[in-house]
Interface confidence: low
Amino acid sequence: SWMWNQFFLLEEYTGSDYQYVGKLHSDQDRGDGSLKYILSGDGAGDLFIINENTGDIQATKRLDREEKPVYILRAQAINRRTGRPVEPESEFIIKIHDINDNEPIFTKDVYTATVPEMADVGTFVVQVTATDADDPTYGNSAKVVYSILQGQPYFSVESETGIIKTALLNMDRENREQYQVVIQAKDMGGQMGGLSGTTTVNITLTDVNDNPPRFPQSTYQFKTPESSPPGTPIGRIKASDADVGENAEIEYSITDGEGHDMFDVITDQETQEGIITVKKLLDFEKKRVYTLKVEASNPHIEPRFLYLGPFKDSATVRIVVDDVDEPPVFSKPAYILQIREDAQINTTIGSVAAQDPDAARNPVKYSVDRHTDMDRIFNIDSGNGSIFTSKLLDRETLLWHNITVIATEINNPKQSSRVPLYIKVLDVNDNAPEFAEFYETFVCEKAKADQLIQTLHAVDKDDPYSGHQFSFSLAPEAASGSNFTIQDNKDNTAGILTRKNGYNRHEMSTYLLPVVISDNDYPVQSSTGTVTVRVCACDHHGNMQSCHAEALIHPTGLSTGA
């Protein structure tokens, strides 16, 4: 039987001769050279050679355990004479023995990590890891210990885990943001003679809100014209905050001051400035200076830093309102005046008033916008604003006159204002009533007395306060001996009645009745209108059958035959 089972061989042999591995030996070997030893398997004949007579095995090259830790070979012992095996072929192994020939290597050449500024001591930052290719099961060649070479006193590393932690209280990003830490990993449990590797860890402190906003000055002053409309920006203020990102965001507000309701402050999200804007219309003549207290505060606060003080700051903002040359202001937005239509030229109707609202109180002159009074019916006293007529009026032609009056600063003609002026022309009884239409009627030859043949209506261009009251009568020259009568209905109408039984169209075919219409106003106005009555032949139902047409060409006027 074979007298071996496995061999051990030290890796990385540096001797000049081949490295002796061991000896294959069969108890059938009598030492007379009758047996031949044969080696096959991993590296046989190349890496490993055997003396076929003695069975001595040697390694021809340096072996590296980290490359191949175990070699499996087969041994044979053959009788040289017969060529037959004297032992069954058997497998054996060569184990490569480890030496500490590999240093620890970190998984990254450079690590990057962040940790909040002001973090508590012992706050986890990052874990680094190094691996050692040597045999972890034998000795301490692969036992790695971590230590910090650079980065104290700010950071520490746990020797066994490679966990880096903060080691200093109150590390302030605003003071220093970047740290470079060098970590060493050493094998042999860190003992002398151990191999080592290093890595760099770049650590950045991230921002926390540990700084309040601060105004660089305690007082700001701005100017704005009184005419600035609401929303007009008049100045910018900026508080600085040493933090970054949302921790440096600032909200501005007006917390106090006499102009609290006159101004607003809005935050410009891009620049983190506070923009002071006009909230309500300003008036230099009412108030010329405003003082505000503006506060800048952080909207995102970390409660654990409240002990550092309030995260806000205040400044005083003084706003000076500049006078602007404003146009004159009328005492009313519109004026309504009245004048009788019989007013003489140069009659004063009323007046308008405007004044310069500026502190200077510049004098004002008045004029009529001629585009609104093309016929130059009205005029205005340029000094006192009195409106007077320059032509005669007629209510029946135009009831309302809508004109525009301009007030202009004498010292600055560009500063002008306009106001509408509505002038109502009041009625005077200067028109007589007239027939509402041309009246032409007929009467049957066989008509009976007191028969109504026509109802009369009248119109009057005037517009009396108590309404129209017309009276109707035959003209005096036609009243006596007339063939017809006028009946006044007292409701602004009248009827024409027959006065006799029967008319003869051959004797008188047409009657012209002069009717006087009067109104009941002062002074009384009257006119005479003519009604044409034609005599016609009628059937027994009273339907007209034939009439003479001469009346159609008769001039309107009086007829002695009425």
């Epitope: 014209p225 005419s227 409309p229 609401p230 929303g231 007009t232 602007v324 146009p327 003609p413 560009k414």
Partner: antibody, heavy 127, light 107 residues
């Protein structure tokens, strides 16, 4: 910064309608009066109309050639000015600009200048 | 209505003074504004209220209003000032532009 951007232009047949928009940014839109001004190809500037701010009544005025056909409106919640054009004629072909009235430059009523203009949008009326 | 009349064109050598007029019978009563327009661009306000200059407009631009004429003056004219110039005024709520003047900078 103040920006005015017109949109909605294009080709339309005579008698047709078109609605232009003008999107504003960079200023307090609701405090300002705004104009529409047009420019026919190779010609000068022609005023179309104006709309005042709501605080000043929000009233509109129009040039005689467009009165009754064009309507100006504004949506202060969207910072947008509109021009509704109806019964379009070939002579309405032009680049249409919106312009802001500057209330901080001048204090004389109607007489404000136009301090910011958009780049314009082309309206072509053709059959 | 107000009417504003401008010369169609004005030529000037670089460095010289250019004057563009705007005439109308209502000019003494109403303020005049001036706009510059370069090809393919929107108008830019260069003078307002007869003689005031907006911020960002060079000092060489000035304006005046006398009698029935408003004048835009560009002293020390530069090549970049070549553009169309429009006067504008407002009367009775109606905005009116002049017909425009093409300023050519020679050379």
């Amino acid at each position: 910064q103040v920006q005015l951007v017109e949109s909605g232009g294009g080709l339309v047949k005579p008698g047709g309608s078109l609605r232009l928009s003008c999107a504003a940014s960079g200023f307090t839109f609701n405090s300002y009066a705004l104009h529409w001004v047009r420019q026919a190809p190779g010609k000068g500037l022609e005023w179309v109309g104006r709309i005042k701010s709501k605080t000043n009544g929000g009233t509109t005025d129009y040039a005689a050639p467009v009165k009754g056909r064009f309507t100006i409106s504004r949506d202060d919640s969207k910072n947008t000015l509109y021009l509704q054009m109806n019964s379009l004629k070939t002579e309405d072909t032009a680049v249409y600009y919106c312009a802001r009235v500057d209330a901080t430059y001048s204090y004389s009523g109607y007489y404000y200048p136009m301090d910011y203009w958009g780049q314009g949008t082309l309206v072509t009326v053709s059959s | 209505d107000i009417e504003l009349t401008q010369p169609p064109s004005v030529s000037v050598s670089p460095g010289q003074t250019a004057s563009i007029t705007c005439s109308g019978d209502k000019i003494p009563t109403y303020t005049v504004h001036w706009y510059q327009q370069k090809p393919g661009q929107a108008p830019v306000l260069v003078i307002y209220d007869d003689n005031k200059r907006p911020s960002g407009i060079p000092e060489r631009f000035s304006g005046s209003n006398s009698g029935n004429t408003a004048t835009l003056t560009i002293s020390g004219t530069q090549a970049e000032d070549e553009a169309d110039y429009y006067c504008q005024s407002t009367a009775s709520g109606t905005v009116v532009f002049g017909g425009g003047t093409k300023l050519t900078v020679l050379g």
